[in-house]
């Protein structure tokens, strides 16, 4: 169904990183506009991005209300300048998105090494606990606060003078690793949610090397 001068949206795709969540779709509009609606499985539809010519809609504010809920969105197509017009079935043309569960599906953003501190033959590497857009009691929660023990980090490190790498794991935001005294090391971290089957790992953090600002060193 539909009018002769509107086409239904297609390729509806969720793009989400650390809960910042945008719905994208096609096609670029020609003489038409879009409105997006979102709901939980049991909830009412809420309209967003009214009569837009964009092909994306930021739905972060809605999904952060409960990141463990499963959401469905739909994109309505209207003729430009005649948004009252409906399809032949008496309702606007629309297309449904895939279901989306933020807690299970949001991509893990690239982590950042906050600091490293050497004491003798030990180095403590700390991963920045990034703030998300998920709120609780008016406060933005960190990634660790949202995911708890479901979130882990994997450290990859090597001597600056060598290509041979090692790895270590933590389910906190800190690593304590053994190093050779007098050697500089380079570090990179990756976030991981072991219980997931998709979107389990983040991209690697930028590499940080000892002797280049970030760390503090104590003999």
């Amino acid at each position: 169904s539909g009018t002769t001068n509107t086409v239904a949206a297609y390729n509806l795709t969720w793009k989400s990183t650390n809960f910042k969540t945008i719905l994208e779709w096609e096609p670029k509009p020609v003489n038409q506009v879009y409105t997006v609606q979102i709901s939980t499985k049991s909830g009412d539809w809420k309209s967003k991005c009214f009569y837009t010519t964009d092909t994306e809609c930021d739905l972060t504010d809605e999904i952060v209300k409960d990141v463990k809920q499963t959401y469905l969105a739909r994109v309505f197509s209207y003729p430009a300048g005649n948004v009252e017009s409906t399809g032949s079935a008496g309702e606007p043309l629309y297309e449904n998105s895939p279901e989306f569960t933020p807690y299970l599906e949001t991509n893990l953003g690239q982590p950042t090494i906050q600091s490293f501190e050497q004491v003798g033959t030990k180095v403590n590497v700390t991963v920045e606990d990034e703030r998300t857009l998920v709120r609780k009691n008016g406060t933005f929660l960190t990634l660790r606060q949202v995911f708890g023990n479901d979130l882990g980090y994997i450290l990859t490190y090597r001597k600056s003078s060598s290509s041979g790498k090692k790895t270590a794991k933590t389910n906190t935001n800190e690593f304590l690793i053994d190093v050779d005294k007098g050697e500089n090391y380079c570090f990179s971290v990756q976030a991981v949610i072991p219980s997931r089957t998709v979107n389990r790992k983040s991209t690697d953090s930028p590499v940080e090397c000892m002797g280049q600002e970030k760390g503090e060193f104590r003999e």
Epitope: I154, T156, K165, T167, K169, Q190, V192, P194, R200, D204
Partner: antibody, heavy 117, light 107 residues
Framework: QVQLVESGGGVVQPGRSLRLSCKAS????????MHWVRQAPGKGLEWIGL????????IYDPKFQGRFTISADNSKNTLFLQMDSLRPEDTAVYYC??????????WGQGTPVTVSS | DIQMTQSPSSLSASVGDRVTITCKAS??????LNWYQQKPGKAPKLLIY???SLADGVPSRFSGSGSGTDYTFTISSLQPEDIATYYC?????????FGQGTKLEIT
């Protein structure tokens, strides 16, 4: 369902090379760390190394560094172990395994390699 | 590198017995320890992960305990099908290391 199938084992002369494959199905290897483990006849399990197929990062037990090379072809969902300068003591069953970060949850059936003249 | 010392290397017990195997790490491995069962000609099978968590589908007679450097694997009531070799694995940092294995036999 998740499955790992190794192939490429066989009898090879000392000093020669061999390339083992591990074909994964039921999941994308790029979502996991993937490992190679071996077991010599009548002996224990020995970790060789791992790869993050998403970015190609590899980490080895130092005793295998330089002689063994782990790689992956994400388009074929397949893991490889290139073994060079083989020695009689490399005779073993070679396993690939999937790592969910808390444990190796799936293993292949193993492929036997015999290094003998 | 972290060394894993597993004991005993072999063990003979009767059906219904309580069986205990230990693994000692050369440094703190922060519970990144798994226990595997291996039967002849087969790949290892996961029993316990993160030192104390029972893997899916594994009978409750199997359990794990420990933290830091000392870990224990227990079969509360030995069954005939438990005849196998058992390995611990530390994966807290590379190179990952297995214990030497414990061969379990029934008397």
């Amino acid at each position: 369902q998740v499955q790992l199938v190794e192939s490429g084992g066989g009898v090879v002369q000392p000093g020669r090379s061999l390339r083992l494959s591990c074909k994964a199905s039921g999941f994308n290897i790029k979502d996991y760390y993937m490992h190679w483990v071996r077991q010599a006849p009548g002996k224990g399990l020995e970790w060789i190394g791992l790869i993050d197929p998403e970015n190609g990062n590899t980490i080895y037990d130092p005793k295998f560094q330089g002689r063994f090379t782990i790689s992956a072809d994400n388009s074929k969902n397949t893991l490889f172990l290139q073994m060079d300068s083989l020695r009689p003591e490399d005779t073993a069953v070679y396993y690939c395994a999937r790592d969910n970060s808390y444990y190796f949850d799936y293993w292949g059936q193993g492929t036997p390699v015999t290094v003998s003249s | 590198d972290i060394q894993m010392t597993q004991s005993p290397s072999s063990l003979s017990a009767s059906v219904g017995d309580r069986v205990t195997i230990t693994c000692k790490a050369s440094q703190d491995i922060r519970k990144y320890l798994n226990w595997y069962q291996q039967k002849p000609g087969k790949a290892p099978k996961l029993l316990i992960y993160y030192a104390t968590s029972l893997a899916d589908g594994v009978p409750s007679r199997f359990s794990g305990s420990g933290s830091g450097t000392d870990y224990t694997f227990t079969i509360s009531s030995l069954q005939p099908e438990d005849i196998a070799t058992y390995y611990c694995l530390q994966h807290g940092e590379s190179p990952y290391t297995f214990g030497q294995g414990t061969k379990l036999e029934i008397t």
